[in-house]
């Protein structure tokens, strides 16, 4: 008789999740010399220990502490790029501008990017059928708590000028409920971070509006200023040209505004 299993509203654990995490870890530690001493089996043990046998609506940041410790990574703190609702362009940018880092360019972000996972209370099984949805089921689920925890640590580690890429095509360019708006903004350390510079990415080719004047950007400026961090904002009118100019800064067309 099949055992009754909790049905959640979200998709289940990504297939071959353990193998994927382990393989990503091995690949990452081979490529990044500063992480080559990391034991990927211990990393997987710590990852697994954070959610296996635990109720998937009752996960805490403390559950992830061992994984966070093993994944501690010293990235240049003045080369951090945060993003909100524009992941692909942010990643394309750091693939070209190799000295800058998004969260997904770090070991922990790389391990979990685009994956889903959850377990079940009191069993050592991984749930491949369904996992809690943040809105419909619960916010303290394994995936949400993981990203909240790594995002907080990533923001805490930042210094000097921190950049954030924002999606100018969305109704809320800055969304207080996004990971950036609810976690990262509030965990930048004013004693280390001098400026937050927002890059607002335009969607339409003919969109010449100054989206830095958008009310949600003004709201972000207000939050940041109250935290004693300076704020600046730039419009990126042509993201395609922006990336091209990052690749080839000597190009004559790259002196004009992008």
């Amino acid at each position: 008789v099949p055992r009754w299993r909790q049905q959640w509203s979200g998709p289940g654990t990504t297939k071959r999740f353990p193998e994927t995490v382990l393989a990503r870890c091995v690949k990452y530690t081979e490529i990044h010399p500063e992480m080559r001493h990391v034991d990927c089996q211990s990393v997987w043990d710590a990852f697994k220990g954070a959610f296996i046998s635990k109720h998937p609506c009752n996960i805490t940041e403390e559950d992830y502490q061992p994984l966070m410790k093993l994944g501690t990574q010293t990235v240049p703190c003045n080369k951090i790029l945060l993003w909100s609702r524009i992941k692909d362009l942010a990643h394309q940018f750091t693939q070209v501008q190799r000295d800058m880092f998004t969260l997904e360019d770090t070991l922990l972000g790389y391990l979990a990017d685009d994956l889903t996972w959850c377990g079940e209370f009191n069993t050592s099984k991984i749930n491949y059928q369904s996992c809690p949805d943040w809105r419909k089921d619960c916010s303290n689920n394994p995936v949400s708590v993981f990203w909240k925890t790594v995002s907080r640590r990533f923001a805490e580690a930042a210094c000097d000028v921190v950049h954030v890429m924002l999606n100018g095509s969305r109704s809320k360019i800055f969304d207080k409920n996004s990971t950036f708006g609810s976690v990262e903004v509030h965990n930048l350390q004013p004693e280390k971070v001098q400026t937050l510079e927002a890059w607002v990415i335009h969607g339409g080719r003919e969109d010449s509006r100054d989206l830095c004047q958008d009310p949600t950007i003004k709201e972000l400026e207000s939050i940041i200023s109250k935290r004693n961090i300076q704020f600046s904002c730039k419009n990126i009118y042509r993201p395609d040209k922006f990336l091209q100019c990052v690749k080839n800064p000597e190009d004559s067309s790259c002196t004009s505004e992008i």
């Epitope: 500063e34 992480m35 001493h37 990391v38 211990s42 043990d45 710590a46 697994k48 220990g49 296996i52 046998s53 940041e61 559950d63 502490q65 061992p66 966070m68 410790k69 093993l70 994944g71 501690t72 990574q73 010293t74 240049p76 703190c77 907080r152 640590r153 805490e156 580690a157 210094c159 280390k192």
Partner: antibody
């Protein structure tokens, strides 16, 4: 009161083995990283290994300690162990166990230390 | 391998003197400021003085202060007291949760 008490040190011949113990009391043992750190006579401090076991042991080692040293834990006895094999003269040191501060803002620092146990490797 | 270099290795001071110890790391510490300072007296275990470069550990007198970021850090004792003659170690926290200690600075009575 937080207490860590090391034992098991002594004289051992090169190539020999030794198991050190670190008995803990006064705190919730499962919720902290316990770190082994050593100090050669008249020299500086050097970290050896770390263990944490809220649910299953999670452990890791200094590069030089991998393969020869093994850290383990017995939660029922509130004790951490350091098994040292293939010992060499350069392993002669006082071995300390220390408790790391808890909380993500404080990890990476050692707030409570044992008194140390001396290991001498000599023929 | 990460190297933490402390200078000077020995320092002679009189009671009331201002003392500064420097610690240089071959790699940036985690978060730019994840560095601690410890005090050790002969035959005793080290005692945590300072964490995250500039935060005073519980019960440590305010004459101790720390500063620095990235790879360069300093520990200052504004007015050395008889109880402060000891050896001081810096300790950094790095990628993969690894630790490294400096070689130590012995503060002795002039």
């Amino acid at each position: 009161e937080v207490q860590l008490l090391e034992s098991g040190g002594g004289l051992v011949q090169p190539g020999g083995s030794l198991r050190l113990s670190c008995a803990a009391s006064g705190f919730s043992f499962n919720n902290y990283w316990i770190i082994w750190i050593r100090q050669a006579p008249g020299k500086g401090l050097e970290w050896v290994a770390a263990i944490y076991s809220p649910s299953g042991d999670i452990k890791y080692y200094a590069d030089w300690a991998k393969g020869r040293f093994t850290v383990s834990k017995d939660n029922s006895k509130n004790t951490v162990y350091l098994q040292m094999n293939s010992l060499r003269a350069e392993d002669t040191a006082v071995y300390y166990c220390a408790r790391e501060l808890s909380g993500s803002s404080y990890e990476g620092y050692f707030e409570s230390w044992g008194q140390g146990t001396l290991v001498t490797v000599s023929s | 391998d990460i190297q933490l270099t402390q200078s000077p290795s020995t320092l002679s001071a009189s009671v009331g003197d201002r003392v500064t110890i420097t610690c240089r790391s071959s790699q940036s510490v985690y978060g730019h400021n994840w560095l601690a300072w410890y005090q050790q007296k002969p035959g005793k275990a080290p005692k945590l003085l300072m964490y995250r470069a500039s935060n005073l550990a519980s019960g440590v007198p305010s004459r101790f202060s720390g500063s620095g970021s990235g790879t360069e850090f300093t520990l200052t004792i504004s007015s050395v007291q008889p109880d402060d003659f000891a050896t001081y170690y810096c300790q950094g926290y790095y990628s993969g949760g690894s630790y490294a200690f400096g070689g130590g600075t012995k503060v002795e009575i002039k």
